[in-house]
Amino acid sequence: IWELKKDVYVVELDWYPDAPGEMVVLTCDTPEEDGITWTLDQSSEVLGSGKTLTIQVKEFGDAGQYTCHKGGEVLSHSLLLLHKKEDGIWSTDILKDQKEPKNKTFLRCEAKNYSGRFTCWWLTTISTDLTFSVKSSRGSSDPQGVTCGAATLSAERVRGDNKEYEYSVECQEDSACPAAEESLPIEVMVDAVHKLKYENYTSSFFIRDIIKPDPPKNLQLKPLKNSRQVEVSWEYPDTWSTPHSYFSLTFCVQVQGKSKREKKDRVFTDKTSATVICRKNASISVRAQDRYYSSSWSEWASVPCS
Amino acid sequence: RAVPGGSSPAWTQCQQLSQKLCTLAWSAHPLVGHMDLREEGDEETTNDVPHIQCGDGCDPQGLRDNSQFCLQRIHQGLIFYEKLLGSDIFTGEPSLLPDSPVGQLHASLLGLSQLLQPEGHHWETQQIPSLSPSQPWQRLLLRFKILRSLQAFVAVAARVFAHGAATLSP
């Protein structure tokens, strides 16, 4: 058993049929010694008396808010949550496996630049009695500070018969050094509590590996005289690291109709302009990627050909 | 060329060669996302690798103030990786595929280090750690880790030379 926060405790249980469970001793936070009784949740049934209460925690019915009283007055509370371990593996029931970029990916994180700011998000089908707490650091043995905000519900989607909820959090490294080569990864830890179930999820990454630039901005077309060709120009996204002579991007320019199966024109360039062939009912799209490190491409920025 | 005395390097040549190094490093180990190397206990491998750190002057302001600190750091790293790529970690079993870009990568690391430091001038270099994995599978894992680390190192070096070529060239 360990303390998650004040008056909230996590009991770690091996979860299998007829498991013996964990013996837990609760102590009433009071100077009083006599006349103390214990109850669980809203029940008035007295579970025991005395300054300490010893219980055998085996299942969710044994978890909950234990309260010690004296003469009708509440003295203190202890909330017990369960953390299940099945076949040596901690349960991951609360969050959905996003399966990208690999199986058992529960947290996904992205950064728009090298400033040390990043966003993480996760998915669940649970809509109520759900809380999240996020901590982060650079490195684990001698951790350096990363400050995370509160996790918020950022999207709701309908997936078949189920509703899916997306939560996200923004974090900022306290003393970021955008030009340095990272040697210690960022660690992100999410505590998830659903009713009386506790789970924790972690992710470890370098900012350089989660970079995904915003799409290029200000796409403009200039038809070339006596030609089917069009000069397309664009600018670096505002959110990308500066100066651009140092933090350079490379670009992919594509002309394609509405369907992915249609024919296309495609060219790669390090410049902020390119010449392509425009077709009626097609769009010109441009996306960006770090020029020197193969992290994710941005989403496409598009303009119609006509 | 960047000599210890402080003259300027051939920024454009260094830019071209460092960008080539980036391409080669990713060709040598493209399957980056397919193996989470941090799960394999990185400390003993990459702790000894020379990283370009915050105080090394490789940021745009540091380069403007005095590029020598940064260039020396890059030079150290190039020599370090060049030696690693020439060591039995890469030459031993399992043999690299003959079409592996590691050979070109090795040569290009040497080429860029020579551009930065002509013969006759000597910056102190970092000792190569004695990493002699006994098992072929350990050697394979070590190769992946080294190439991953090299990708990050050459990306910073390429940014430095691109910025230098754009803003510090005579």
Partner: antibody, heavy 118, light 107 residues
Framework: EVQLVQSGAEVKKPGATVKISCKAS????????LHWVRQAPEKGLEWMGW????????EYAPKFQGRVTITADTSTDTGYLELSSLRSEDTAVYYC???????????WGQGTLVTVSS | DIQMTQSPSSVSASVGDRVTITCRAS??????LHWYQQKPGKAPKLLIY???QSISGVPSRFSGYGSGTDFSLTINSLQPEDFATYYC?????????FGGGTKVEIK
């Protein structure tokens, strides 16, 4: 199977015009760009131009501008190359090539030898 | 026009050898570079597109690499059917241009 079948060899006099055909099969003709590339004896490859069969848009290499016409007939799934004012240095194998991507060539015809000789 | 220079113009090699052909562009072309194989009396065949992307059905012994102005095609463990002429082609800008070709001959 995507295939391009070209018309047979031609012998032409200098100053004449040649028209070669390229019949597509195994795909929707207008879904691919069609290019023409030539190769002089013992020489390298030289791109001449392309057509989008869907709308008839064309682009020619400056070297051939004014002398070359590329057309496409969607009713017969056939592309054509017409080269006028022939000279001896136009003696070459002419290939049609197609792809969904405009700038490189995925599928090739077998080639048509055009000999220009007086 | 962008000039593409291939080297060597010919190379003699034996079955099992590793052969590397290089292609240099007269200006930077990013990764807009493609490789073809041509056998005598036959049409060219696409091997690699956008510098390093492999084509399904093309043996994995063919690999491409490069960016900017310098590119290479490597044939690892040359097979009897690989004796042919190889061409690079840039697609950075029109007109599309090819290298002069590299003939891989039997030693």
């Amino acid at each position: 199977e995507v295939q391009l079948v070209q018309s047979g060899a031609e012998v032409k006099k200098p100053g004449a015009t040649v028209k070669i055909s390229c019949k597509a099969s195994g795909y929707t003709f207008s879904d691919y760009y069609l290019h023409w590339v030539r190769q002089a004896p013992e020489k390298g490859l030289e791109w001449m131009g392309w057509i989008d069969p869907e709308n008839g848009d064309t682009e020619y290499a400056p070297k051939f501008q004014g002398r070359v016409t590329i057309t496409a007939d969607t009713s017969t799934d056939t592309g054509y190359l017409e080269l006028s004012s022939l000279r001896s240095e136009d003696t070459a194998v002419y290939y049609c090539a197609a792809n969904k991507e405009l700038r490189y060539f995925d599928v090739w015809g077998q080639g048509t030898l055009v000999t220009v000789s007086s | 026009d962008i000039q593409m220079t291939q080297s060597p113009s010919s190379v003699s090699a034996s079955v099992g050898d590793r052969v590397t052909i290089t292609c240099r562009a007269s200006q930077s072309i990013s990764i807009n570079l493609h490789w073809y194989q041509q056998k005598p009396g036959k049409a060219p065949k696409l091997l690699i597109y956008f510098a390093s992307q492999s084509i399904s059905g093309v043996p994995s012994r063919f690999s491409g690499y490069g960016s900017g102005t310098d590119f290479s095609l490597t044939i690892n463990s040359l097979q009897p059917e690989d004796f042919a002429t190889y061409y690079c082609q840039q697609s950075n800008s029109f007109p599309l241009t090819f290298g002069g070709g590299t003939k891989v001959e039997i030693k």
